[in-house]
């Protein structure tokens, strides 16, 4: 990712910029954007970034709001990179089962599972 | 999901079945399955379930190991349902920004971001 700051710092900065520019971003009263109806955000990265694209095209650019969308684009690059790494290594069944166990463990403890 | 037990209970039961059948599942010494090289499991659900399919096709069925793969198939159905809900509702910019802020907050606190 062509960024001088680590992704974790990039996310923090983006959160701050989002708060700063909120008033400007919500100026369009008529715009509607798809919003996921659950809290398992990682499952919805494509839709989130499509929404960001819609918002960017409707927002007057300039100053630090440009920085916000640049950051969001770098975060997208990071996530796309992570997605590429999903099938990168072919490992033994043992390793796959460890990962599957980890995945189900995370589902069990961290996912928001509505009854 | 056509299952009598809630998804959370299904996940717990599947974790237990995975431990029970581990020895049988790892019997194939030569089989290689793609394993993600990071810990952000939700980004890799497609690859994980492709791997489960590969494993199932190589595993002698019968008894409770069948129950394991049935459970995993129900979990996949649940996740596919969640993915469909990613773009289900078109909301105002305000709501989208709330969700985006939440997403970045989760990235900031819960994602495993390697330097």
């Amino acid at each position: 990712i062509p960024t001088e700051i680590p992704t974790s710092a990039l996310v923090k900065e983006t959160l701050a910029l989002l708060s700063t520019h909120r008033t400007l971003l919500i100026a369009n009263e008529t715009l509607r954007i798809p919003v996921p109806v659950h809290k398992n955000h990682q499952l919805c990265t494509e839709e989130i970034f499509q929404g960001i694209g819609t918002l960017e095209s409707q927002t007057v650019q300039g100053g630090t709001v440009e920085r916000l969308f640049k950051n969001l684009s770098l975060i997208k690059k990071y996530i796309d990179g992570q997605k590429k790494k999903c099938g990168e290594e072919r490992r033994r069944v043992n390793q796959f089962l460890d990962y599957l166990q980890e995945f189900l463990g995370v589902m069990n403890t961290e996912w928001i599972i509505e009854s | 999901i056509p299952t009598e037990i809630p998804t959370s209970a299904l996940v717990k039961e599947t974790l237990a079945l995975l431990s029970t059948h581990r020895t049988l599942l790892i019997a194939n010494e030569t089989l290689r399955i793609p394993v993600p090289v990071h810990k952000n499991h939700q980004l890799c659900t497609e690859e994980i379930f492709q791997g489960i399919g590969t494993l199932e096709s190589q595993t002698v069925q019968g008894g409770t190991v069948e129950r394991l793969f049935k459970n995993l198939s129900l979990i996949k159905k649940y996740i596919d349902g969640q993915k469909k809900k990613c773009g289900e509702e078109r909301r105002r910019v305000n709501q989208f920004l709330d969700y985006l802020q939440e997403f970045l907050g989760v990235m900031n606190t819960e994602w495993i971001i390697e330097s």
């Epitope: 290594e89 072919r90 490992r91 033994r92 043992n94 390793q95 089962l97 460890d98 990962y99 166990q101 980890e102 463990g105 | 974790l15 431990s19 394993v35 993600p36 090289v37 990071h38 810990k39 495993i112 390697e114």
Partner: antibody
């Protein structure tokens, strides 16, 4: 910054027991598998044991199987190695190590703790 | 178990020399191989992972190559601070196994 600090080493008689600890900080401990590796004086490195992030999977070298037990307390960010029925050949510096990502285990290493088994 | 045969066991070279260490696995390990540097009295330090990837903040004079069973570790221009023992290690399967080590000295 990732930090791993081993403790619990010392002198013990053959047949005795010892429990090593490794205090971890600077990363999400419960998300990573952890390992123990040892090095006898003047010798090379030997992997001892690994435990997955949740503690659900454990692996051991044949040389320690049935005598050593690896465990972890994710609420305390601490890794353990319970060593029983110790032998002279278990004398070594014991290092704990954090995985880089799935199954690429030995990324960051602690500075090690010396275990001496002698009468 | 997968055996890792590392050679040479020791070598002596001059500052600026190119140094090569080889590691052979007893079976195909794809590219699941790490290289470590260990200085006297210190813990090992990861230099190369997945056979050829340079770990963050490791000088670019270090490199790794190979796949399957044959792997090579290279120091393109030996520096005084590179005096250490170098180990290869496979992580294809348990038990994880190391090469016997190569002690690098300055001539």
């Amino acid at each position: 910054e990732v930090q791993l600090l081993e403790s619990g080493g010392g002198l013990v008689q053959p047949g005795g027991s010892l429990r090593l600890s490794c205090a971890a900080s600077g990363f999400t401990f419960s998300s990573y598998a952890m390992s123990w590796v040892r090095q006898a004086p003047g010798k090379g490195l030997e992997w001892v044991s690994t435990i997955s992030g949740s503690g659900g999977s454990t692996y051991y070298a044949d040389s320690v199987k049935g005598r050593f037990t690896i465990s972890r307390d994710n609420s305390k960010n601490t890794l353990y190695l319970q060593m029983n029925s110790l032998r002279a050949e278990d004398t070594a510096v014991y290092y704990c190590a954090k995985e880089r990502y799935n199954w690429n285990y030995l990324h960051y290493w602690g500075q090690g703790t010396l275990v001496t088994v002698s009468s | 178990d997968i055996q890792m045969t590392q050679s040479p066991s020791s070598l002596s070279a001059s500052v600026g020399d190119r140094v090569t260490i080889t590691c052979q696995a007893s079976q195909d390990i794809i590219n699941y191989l790490n290289w470590y540097q260990q200085k006297p009295g210190k813990a090992p330090k990861l230099l190369i992972y997945s056979a050829s990837n340079l770990e963050t903040r490791v000088p670019s004079r270090f490199s790794g190559s190979g796949s399957g069973t044959d792997f090579t570790f290279t120091i393109s221009s030996l520096q005084p601070e590179d005096i250490a023992t170098y180990y290869c290690q496979q992580y294809d399967n348990h038990p994880l196994t190391f090469g016997g080590g190569t002690k690098v000295e300055i001539r």
